[in-house]
Amino acid sequence: FKVATPYSLYVCPEGQQVTLTCRLLGPVDKGHDVTFYKTWYRSSRGEVQTCSERRPIRNLTFQDLHLHHGGHQAANTSHDLAQRHGLESASDHHGQFSITMRNLTLLDSGLYCCLVVEIRHHHSEHRVHGAMELQVQTGKDAPSNCVVYPSSSQDSENIT
């Protein structure tokens, strides 16, 4: 399987909210001994591999923001913690999962990574990730709403 990032760049005004999205593609094994671990974190375009370093998002680690299978947040404690930081991670049953960040500030600008781990018990873990850039802008040059740039081309879309 692969992870697709519909948008590679999100440009948003300060104070707005944004939902960063990843999608699971390809054949997904739903066998008894296969489970999925999904999470989000900030990173940098590292020398070895993009997304290899895992930095917190608003002081929340990738452990705090993880999801299981296609369901909702596994632990209420993590969910409540995320909400208090203006974050919410979610997942549907069609392979799409996302993180929503409210009240954006300039400090939120940077590289964001989604990570999916396919866990084949008794065999191995298979991990794939997607990366996207968030630029938070302020002042007269800032857009009124978030503008997203698809990964395949640089055509922009306004989202409200």
Epitope: D33, T35, Y37, V48, Q49, S52, F62, Q63, H66, H68, A74, A75, N76, T77, S78, L115, V117, I119, H121, H122, H123, S124, E125, R127
Partner: antibody, heavy 117, light 107 residues
Amino acid sequence: QVQLQESGPGLVKPSETLSLTCTVSGGSISSYYWSWIRQPPGKGLEWIGYIYYSGSTNYNPSLKSRVTISVDTSKSQFSLKLSSVTAADTAVYYCARDIPAFAFDIWGQGTMVIVSS
Amino acid sequence: EIVLTQSPATLSLSPGERATLSCRASQSVNYYLAWYQQKPGQAPRLLIYDAFNRATGIPARFSGSGSGTDFTLTISSLEPEDFAVYYCQQRISWPLTFGGGTKVEIK
């Protein structure tokens, strides 16, 4: 802050079953892998196996025939049973949280188990 | 199973010196390798994950490098509290395995 605490008898007779419990506090057990690792005196670390939050288990082939790991989510505990023990099973036994695609990030303090008659 | 071989078994150094510890895998583990520090009577502590990323709260003097089969843990300038045993561990496949350890002792 998640903490792990091992408990169980420190002395087991040869051929009997070693039973240990790990209590998880300060966080949910309904996530991650929950593993057992052991360390014979003066030696290195050996991964015994894990139970995943979903109930799936995975054991080291070298111990598989003798190992059972179970979980009681209502008590936030997971347990290790190792049957037909010998003196070679004498070790410090650690429970640990293992995060997918990451590492063993939280460990119990360890409990010494001696196999002797 | 994947066998991890650590060398040297013992490293005798003085505080302030640079320590270089090696871990070699019997087959490629990509960069899916962690390093742990263990002091007498204590549980291991995670230092490095994915070969070169420091875990939360680990001082910058610890650094990891390598990929495939050859990995290195470097302590740039040894502090008194760094004298301990260090283990590498792979997680590309099960069973998860550890190296035999390198003891860093005071010279």
